[in-house]
């Protein structure tokens, strides 16, 4: 039997019911909050064999291994995870061992085993035989080993019945309990599983099988399985379902969903039944099962009831994430707001079309309408009283419309209306007449000449720079000094900077009224000397980062012709120039041989330019004189080699500290501090675990229904 | 915890009409897949039909295709199945069940069930 989609078993222990007949959990399954400690011994699901997804536990009181529960789970898939992980195992206070000794495979994913006072044998369990990379696999903040003393079957009795492998440099037997060994097949089987007596399973099979070579024995499919059989692909008119099985045309028309999404069913994409269309395709009309691919943006077609949708806030332009087409009439008004510009975009930026008209009033947060940053039609449909299908009226901070260089707006119908917008200077209006199309059909007094702009420096001179230099952080520039009529009037510059990958940003980029800012700004004052250019030294940059610069006066407002003179620059583009790469992370080296080495790295964090070349170094060590003196031949404990694992737990750490001759004297010598770099790796890690913390309580606390 | 409680269950003669209903507590009533089942004596539990959260789709088993409607009624948390044209190989133990996210076809593990009610189709 087959239970999903997806099994979430909390608060009450006897919901664990619900697993009795499945063999497949299409899916995840989640068992946790459950805090009263309770009895699990008579509870057994010996007919689970498979989850597709990943496996939660979180806070079960009382459960002390997870070997009774599921004493034949084989495989976990993997297919969708839970923050990367396909097995977490979070503050478990009870649990005493994992005893999942059938489990051989974890396809995809890694696991996370952490915060588990009670926990043992996590070090007798090798992980490597059952996923593929071991490097992502978080386990810490458990029972320390040297509490557990783990110890596998036969090992007191002398006649240990466990296989041994290799771990971090340590050969030693591999088992999940006290009389649970870890399952290895024959290396004539490779990548192959194997049955209960070693033999090998047919190759399209996982995890383990009922009888040798046989693909219609598998516990498990290792690609895809169709009327009883494991195959590496889909037979013809059948299709891939989440991740594991092959249905017809059929079923896929017939799944039902709970979201409300689902009044179109399912679709068959690229061999595949599926929810939705992937992202980038759309459904091939409206009661189609098949997707083609969308031209630009996909269309989302967004309705207001009301047919006017009032913008006041982030949450309400929240309801418009994803909106290509607006169905209905935009007003905004928004009076305050936190990083209010990059927020609207954000929920607001996909929006092409309004189908009525767009109202901006009393919006006295923003500084430009950039934030529509892919509007190109207003239709009109719908017009305020006077035929108006753009209305802007008194938005104090309001300086720019659009970028109208790289904007292409069409106004179908209606007329465009301005007025008490002191800093939106009219030419930039004249702009958007001529742009949007509407030039003419406004009346005299739509756009009024005397209270838009009249607190802006609308005749911009433009200043330009005379010099750059750059350093690996640092980058110089002048410019021309600027003269307007009346030398008083020159106050004192602004430079505005920012890192720009792309040659795309404008002045009003994450811009907002109420202090928001994308870019950083430095004041420099006028030289005294009148014959020196001005300029400034930005320090404190990243190494071969590209940075947008403008520069901007600041003069009186000098009202001439009821309007301010102000000068700016254009903005520049300059990249800072290479530097040293930061180091090479996560470098691993082992021996596949007498005489071979392998080592791997990733590239370093901070690249600090265009990385040509890796150079390695190596020399010769002499042998560890440490190894000659133990006897190997004698029954005492061969004692363990300490590796640094990256993840030493501080509990964990409970030797004295050295006693030797410091500065003269004999004495404890105190433990050398932390470097800057082990530091800020303790810093990570515990913002790491937090990270995950709060996706695992975001994800699973979940409001009682009314 | 889901509860599902069934009613409108009796005796009819064949030809004639029976509206179930099932009254649900304790959850989202639209975020479940809902589902008919039905068990006649001596028989093995049989999927009579389903209906998606937003009531916009449903299927059915083809013994009942034409003759019964499934429908829901999310304001009123409750699901309902219309039989007409009943016949006496209806006569069964009637169950909703109720399926958080998804159903697929043939899918018998519901995550909740009702306890039945008894529909007699007899003259």
């Known amino acids: 039997e087959i239970c999903g989609p997806g099994i979430d078993i909390r608060n009450d222990y006897q919901q664990l019911k619900r697993l009795e007949n499945c063999t497949v959990i299409e899916g995840y399954l989640h068992i946790l909050l459950i805090s009263k400690a309770e009895d699990y011994r008579s509870y057994r699901f010996p007919k689970l064999t498979v989850i597709t997804e990943y496996l939660l536990l979180f806070r079960v009181a009382g459960l002390e291994s997870l070997g009774d529960l599921f004493p034949n789970l084989t495989v976990i898939r993997g297919w969708k995870l839970f923050y990367n992980y396909a097995l977490v195992i979070f503050e478990m206070t009870n649990l005493k061992d994992i005893g999942l000794y059938n489990l051989r495979n974890i396809t995809r994913g890694a696991i996370r085993i952490e915060k588990n006072a009670d926990l043992c044998y996590l070090s007798t369990v090798d992980w490597s035989l059952i996923l593929d990379a071991v490097s992502n696999n978080y386990i810490v903040g458990n029972k320390p080993p040297k509490e557990c003393g783990d110890l596998c079957p036969g090992t007191m009795e002398e006649k240990p019945m466990c296989e041994k492998t290799t771990i971090n440099n340590e050969y030693n037997y591999r088992c999940w309990t006290t009389n649970r060994c870890q399952k290895m097949c024959p290396s004539t089987c490779g990548k192959r599983a194997c049955t209960e007596n070693n033999e090998c399973c047919h190759p399209e099979c996982l995890g383990s099988c009922s009888a040798p070579d046989n693909d219609t024995a598998c516990v498990a499919c290792r690609h895809y399985y169709y009327a009883g059989v494991c195959v590496p692909a889909c037979p013809p008119n059948t299709y891939r379902f989440e991740g594991w099985r092959c249905v017809d045309r059929d079923f896929c028309a017939n799944i039902l969903s709970a979201e409300s999404s689902d009044s179109e069913g399912f679709v068959i994409h690229d061999g595949e039944c599926m929810q939705e269309c992937p992202s980038g395709f759309i459904r091939n009309g409206s009661q189609s099962m098949y997707c083609i691919p969308c031209e630009g943006p996909c269309p989302k077609v967004c309705e207001e009831e009301k047919k006017t949708k009032t913008i006041d806030s982030v949450t309400s332009a929240q309801m418009l994430q994803g909106c290509t087409i607006f169905k209905g009439n935009l007003l905004i008004n928004i009076r305050r707001g936190n990083n209010i510009a990059s927020e609207l975009e954000n929920f607001m930026g996909l929006i092409e079309v309004v189908t009525g008209y767009v109202k901006i009033r009393h919006s006295h947060a923003l500084v430009s309408l950039s934030f529509l940053k892919n509007l190109r039609l207003i239709l009109g449909e719908e017009q305020l009283e006077g035929n108006y299908s753009f209305y802007v009226l008194d938005n104090q901070n309001l300086q720019q419309l659009w970028d109208w260089d790289h904007r292409n707006l069409t106004i179908k119908a209606g007329k465009m209306y301005f007025a008490f917008n002191p800093k939106l200077c009219v030419s930039e209006i004249y702009r958007m007449e001529e742009v949007t199309g509407t030039k003419g059909r406004q009346s005299k007094g739509d756009i009024n000449t005397r209270n838009n702009g009249e607190r802006a420096s609308c005749e911009s001179d433009v200043l330009h720079f005379t010099s750059t230099t750059t350093s690996k952080n640092r980058i110089i520039i002048t410019w021309h000094r600027y003269r307007p009529p009346d030398y008083r009037d020159l106050i004192s510059f602004t430079v505005y900077y920012k890192e720009a990958p792309f040659k795309n940003v404008t002045e009003y980029d994450g811009q907002d009224a109420c202090g928001s800012n994308s870019w950083n700004m430095v004041d420099v004052d006028l030289p005294p000397n009148k014959d020196v250019e001005p300029g400034i030294l930005l320090h404190g940059l990243k190494p071969w980062t590209q940075y947008a610069v403008y520069v901007k006066a600041v003069t009186l407002t000098m009202v001439e012709n009821d309007h301010i003179r102000g000068a700016k620059s254009e903005i520049l583009y300059i990249r800072t120039n290479a530097s040293v790469p930061s180091i090479p992370l996560d470098v691993l080296s082992a021996s596949n041989s007498s005489s071979q080495l392998i080592v791997k790295w990733n590239p370093p964090s901070l690249p600090n330019g265009n990385l040509s070349y890796y150079i390695v170094r190596w020399q010769r060590q002499p042998q560890d004189g440490y190894l000659y003196r133990h006897n190997y031949c004698s029954k005492d404990k061969i004692p363990i080699r300490k590796y640094a694992d990256g993840t030493i737990d501080i509990e964990e750490v409970t030797e004295n500290p050295k006693t030797e001759v410091c500065g003269g004297e004999k004495g404890p010598c105190c433990a050398c501090p932390k470097t800057e770099a082990e530091k800020q790796a303790e810093k990570e890690e515990a913002e790491y675990r937090k990270v995950f913390e709060n996706f695992l309580h975001n994800s699973i606390f979940v409001p009682r229904p009314e | 915890e889901v509860q599902l409680v069934e009613s409108g269950g009796g005796l009819v003669q064949p030809g004639g009409s029976l509206r179930l209903s099932c009254a649900a507590s304790?959850?989202?009533?639209?975020?479940?897949?809902m589902s008919w089942f039905r068990q006649a004596p001596g028989k093995e539990r049989e999927f009579v039909s389903a209906i998606s959260g937003s009531g916009s789709r449903a299927y059915y088993a083809d013994s009942v295709k034409g003759r019964f409607t499934i429908s829901r009624d999310n304001s009123k948390n409750t699901l309902y199945l219309q039989m007409n044209s009943l016949r006496a190989e209806d006569t069964a133990v009637y169950y909703c069940?109720?399926?958080?996210?998804?159903?697929?076809?043939?899918?018998?593990?519901?995550?909740?069930w009702g306890q039945g009610t008894l529909v007699t189709v007899s003259s």
């Open positions: 069940a109720a399926n958080p996210r998804r159903a697929t076809p043939g899918f018998t593990q519901y995550a909740y």
């Open positions: 304790g959850g989202t009533f639209s975020s479940f897949v």
